[in-house]
Interface confidence: medium
C-alpha cells in the first residue's frame, strides 16, 4: 500500500516532519532510515529506523479528583522492519498503571446564614438595583466544598427621579464615492461624510447637553492608483537534478510571473511559482551501527585458581555487547565491545542479613486487565564483608575499584514466617481503560 513519506521523525513528539510526498511504498521511503512514513494523513507516524520503545508519556490525570484513584501512562514501539524488546510489533502500546491521590479528602457542602439587610439603590435617578448578602458559614464547608446557590441577590429599585439625557453622535455615515477610480482626471475629487446627534438626542426636560463638534467633514481623494495590469506566468524552467545520492529526494521546476509583470497594483499570477516531484535513486542509505545493551557480567574468577568465592581475593570479570544494524557502509559503533572490572565473588556465600525497610509501593499489575494490585516488600539484605574497596593489581597502574559480584545466601531471623521476602498487596482503585490516544482503527 502507498504511504506518505517524510524526511524527518521528531522523537520528542512522535510527529512526522518535512513531507516529501505520497504514493510511494514503505520500502522505497525507508531506503533512507532517517525518513518516516504515515499510512494515512493524520495517522500514526512511524520512523524508518529499526524499532525501539518511545519515551514514557506523562502520567494521565488521576481517575478521581479526591481520595485514592489510579492513573495510566504508555510508551509505543516505533520503527520499521523488526521488533522492540519483548518481541513486540511496531505500533504496539505498553502500559503502566499506578495509584494516585490528588486530594486526601472529598469536598463537603456548607450551609447559608440568613440574608443581611438591603443596600441603598445603585443610582440617584431613574431605576437601578439594590443588593443583599449572606455568609456560607452555617455550617462552614469542608475540604474545599462550597454552599449551593448565590452569596448575594439583587432586585430592581426606583428613585422616582427623571434623569437628563445628554446628546451623543451616531456613527459617521459612509464617505461619498470619489468621482474617479484612477488618478489623472480634470478635477481634484472630494469625498464627504456626515453624522446625526441622535444616539441619543439631548432631552428637553430636564435639559441635556448637545453633541460636541461638527456634523460633517470633507477631504480630498488622494493616492488614487494608476489603472492596474494583471500579471501572467512565463514557461516552466528545467527540472532541477535529484539532490540526494540515496533514498528519495525532491526535484523542482520554477516559473516567473513576467508574462507580463503585474503593474500599478494589478493582481500577481494565480497558482504556484514552483512545483515538486519525488525522485527515487533506488539506492539504500547507509545505516550506522547501534550498540545493543551490555550482556551479563561473566563469573568473577582469578586465573589459575579454581574458586575465589567467599574469600578476600580480587578477581576479574567481563561483559560484552553487540554492534547491530550496520548496513550499506554505515558507521561502525564507537566505543569498546568489551568491559572488564575487578571483583570479589560472593556467589552462594552464606552472609548475615538484616531486614530492609518497606520498599515504595510498586506499579499496579496487570495495567490492562481486571483487578490490578500493587505490592511492596521487605527483603532480607546481605551485610557485605568489609573487604578493601580498591586494589592495585599491577605495580604503577594505580588503584582500581573492586565490585562485589554474585548472589549470596543472606540469613535473617524469620519475619511473619518468611526467611527472604515479606510482601504486602493492595488493590488499585478507580482503574481507567488502556485506550490508544491516537484511537487508530485498522
Amino acid at each position: 500500500d502507498p504511504v506518505l513519506c517524510f524526511t524527518q521523525y521528531e522523537e520528542s513528539s512522535g510527529k512526522c516532519k518535512g513531507l516529501l510526498g505520497g504514493g510511494v511504498s514503505v520500502e522505497d521511503c525507508c531506503l533512507n532510515t532517517a525518513f518516516a512514513y504515515q499510512k494515512r494523513s493524520g495517522g500514526l507516524c512511524q520512523p524508518c529506523r529499526s524499532p525501539r520503545w518511545s519515551l514514557w508519556s506523562t502520567w494521565a490525570p488521576c481517575s478521581v479528583t479526591c481520595s485514592e484513584g489510579s492513573q495510566l501512562r504508555y510508551r509505543r514501539c516505533v520503527g520499521w522492519n523488526g521488533q522492540c524488546s519483548g518481541k513486540v510489533a511496531p505500533g504496539t502500546l505498553e502500559w503502566q498503571l499506578q495509584a494516585c491521590e490528588d486530594q486526601q479528602c472529598c469536598p463537603e457542602m456548607g450551609g447559608w446564614s440568613g440574608w443581611g439587610p438591603w443596600e441603598p439603590c445603585s443610582v440617584t435617578c431613574s431605576k437601578g438595583t439594590r443588593t443583599r448578602r449572606r455568609a456560607c458559614n452555617h455550617p462552614a464547608p469542608k475540604c474545599g466544598g462550597h454552599c449551593p446557590g448565590q452569596a448575594q441577590e439583587s432586585e430592581a429599585c426606583d428613585t422616582q427621579q427623571v434623569c437628563p439625557t445628554h446628546g451623543a453622535w451616531a456613527t459617521w455615515g459612509p464617505w461619498t464615492p470619489c468621482s474617479a477610480s484612477c488618478h489623472g482626471g480634470p478635477h481634484e475629487p472630494k469625498e464627504t461624510r456626515s453624522r446625526k446627534c441622535s444616539a441619543p438626542e439631548p432631552s428637553q426636560k430636564p435639559p441635556g447637553k448637545p453633541c460636541p463638534g461638527l456634523a460633517y467633514e470633507q477631504r480630498r481623494c488622494t493616492g488614487l492608483p494608476p489603472c492596474p495590469v494583471a500579471g501572467g506566468w512565463g514557461p516552466w524552467g528545467p527540472v532541477s537534478p535529484c539532490p540526494v545520492t540515496c533514498g528519495l529526494g525532491q526535484t523542482m521546476e520554477q516559473r516567473t510571473c513576467n508574462h507580463p509583470v503585474p503593474q500599478h497594483g494589478g493582481p500577481f499570477c494565480a497558482g504556484d511559482a514552483t512545483r515538486t516531484h519525488i525522485c527515487n535513486t533506488a539506492v539504500p542509505c547507509p545505516v550506522d551501527g547501534e550498540w545493543d545493551s551490555w550482556g551479563e557480567w561473566s563469573p568473577c574468577i582469578r586465573r589459575n585458581m579454581k574458586s575465589i568465592s567467599c574469600q578476600e581475593i580480587p578477581g576479574q570479570q567481563s561483559r560484552g555487547r553487540t554492534c547491530r544494524g550496520r548496513k550499506f557502509d554505515g558507521h561502525r559503533c564507537a566505543g569498546q565491545q568489551q568491559d572488564i572490572r575487578h571483583c570479589y565473588s560472593i556467589q552462594h556465600c552464606p552472609l548475615k542479613g538484616s531486614w530492609s525497610e518497606w520498599s515504595t509501593w510498586g506499579l499496579c499489575m496487570p495495567p490492562c486487565g481486571p483487578n490490578p494490585t500493587r505490592a511492596r516488600q521487605r527483603l532480607c539484605t546481605p551485610l557485605l564483608p568489609k573487604y578493601p574497596p580498591t586494589v592495585s593489581m599491577v605495580e604503577g597502574q594505580g588503584e582500581k575499584n573492586v565490585t562485589f559480584w554474585g548472589r549470596p545466601l543472606p540469613r535473617c531471623e524469620e519475619l511473619q514466617g518468611q526467611k527472604l521476602v515479606v510482601e504486602e498487596k493492595r488493590p488499585c482503585l478507580h482503574v481507567p481503560a488502556c485506550k490508544d490516544p491516537e484511537e487508530e482503527e485498522l
Epitope: 513486540v88 502500559w95 496487570p366 490492562c368 481486571p370 481503560a433 490508544d436 487508530e440
Partner: nanobody, 129 residues
Framework: QVQLVESGGGLVQAGGSLRLSCAAS????????MGWFRQAPGKEREFVAA????????YYADPVKGRFTISRDNAKNTVYLQMSSLKPEDTAVYYC??????????????????????WGQGTQVTVSG
C-alpha cells in the same frame, strides 16, 4: 487454561449474513482480550477483528470495516462476530483467539497473531457467488 469453541459457520449466498460465536471455558473469560482471525485455502492467516476485556475498544481490518461487528457477553463467556454483506472473498476458516491480561494494547498489537495465548479449532464459512 482456557478452551475456545467456535460455532455458527456454514454456507451462505453473497450479500447474506452469519453470526459466529466463540464459547470459552474458565471463570476468568472476562479478563481476556478476544480476537477473530481467518485463513483462506493457500493463504496466510489474517486478522479480522478484536475487542478489549471490558469492551472499551474494538478494532477491525480494512476489508471488513463497516460490514462485521465484534461484541462480547461476559456473563455468557462468549464473543460474537456478526458478519453482513458477505462476499465470496470472505470464504475461510474463522478462528477465535484469547489474550491474557498484559502490559500491551492498540490495534497494531491485537492484529498480531503472536499476541494471543489461546486458539480455537476454527469454523468454516463459505460464501457462494
Amino acid at each position: 487454561q482456557v478452551q475456545l469453541v467456535e460455532s455458527g459457520g456454514g454456507l451462505v449466498q453473497a450479500g447474506g449474513s452469519l453470526r459466529l460465536s466463540c464459547a470459552a471455558s474458565g471463570r476468568t473469560f472476562s479478563s481476556y482480550a478476544m480476537g477473530w482471525f481467518r485463513q483462506a485455502p493457500g493463504k496466510e492467516r489474517e486478522f479480522v477483528a478484536a475487542i478489549t476485556w471490558r469492551g472499551a475498544s474494538t478494532y477491525y481490518a480494512d476489508p471488513v470495516k463497516g460490514r462485521f461487528t465484534i461484541s462480547r457477553d461476559n456473563a455468557k463467556n462468549t464473543v460474537y462476530l456478526q458478519m453482513s454483506s458477505l462476499k465470496p472473498e470472505d470464504t475461510a476458516v474463522y478462528y477465535c483467539a484469547a489474550e491474557e491480561p498484559s502490559y500491551y494494547s492498540g490495534s497494531y498489537y491485537y492484529m498480531m497473531g503472536d499476541s494471543y495465548n489461546y486458539w480455537g479449532q476454527g469454523t468454516q464459512v463459505t460464501v457462494s457467488g
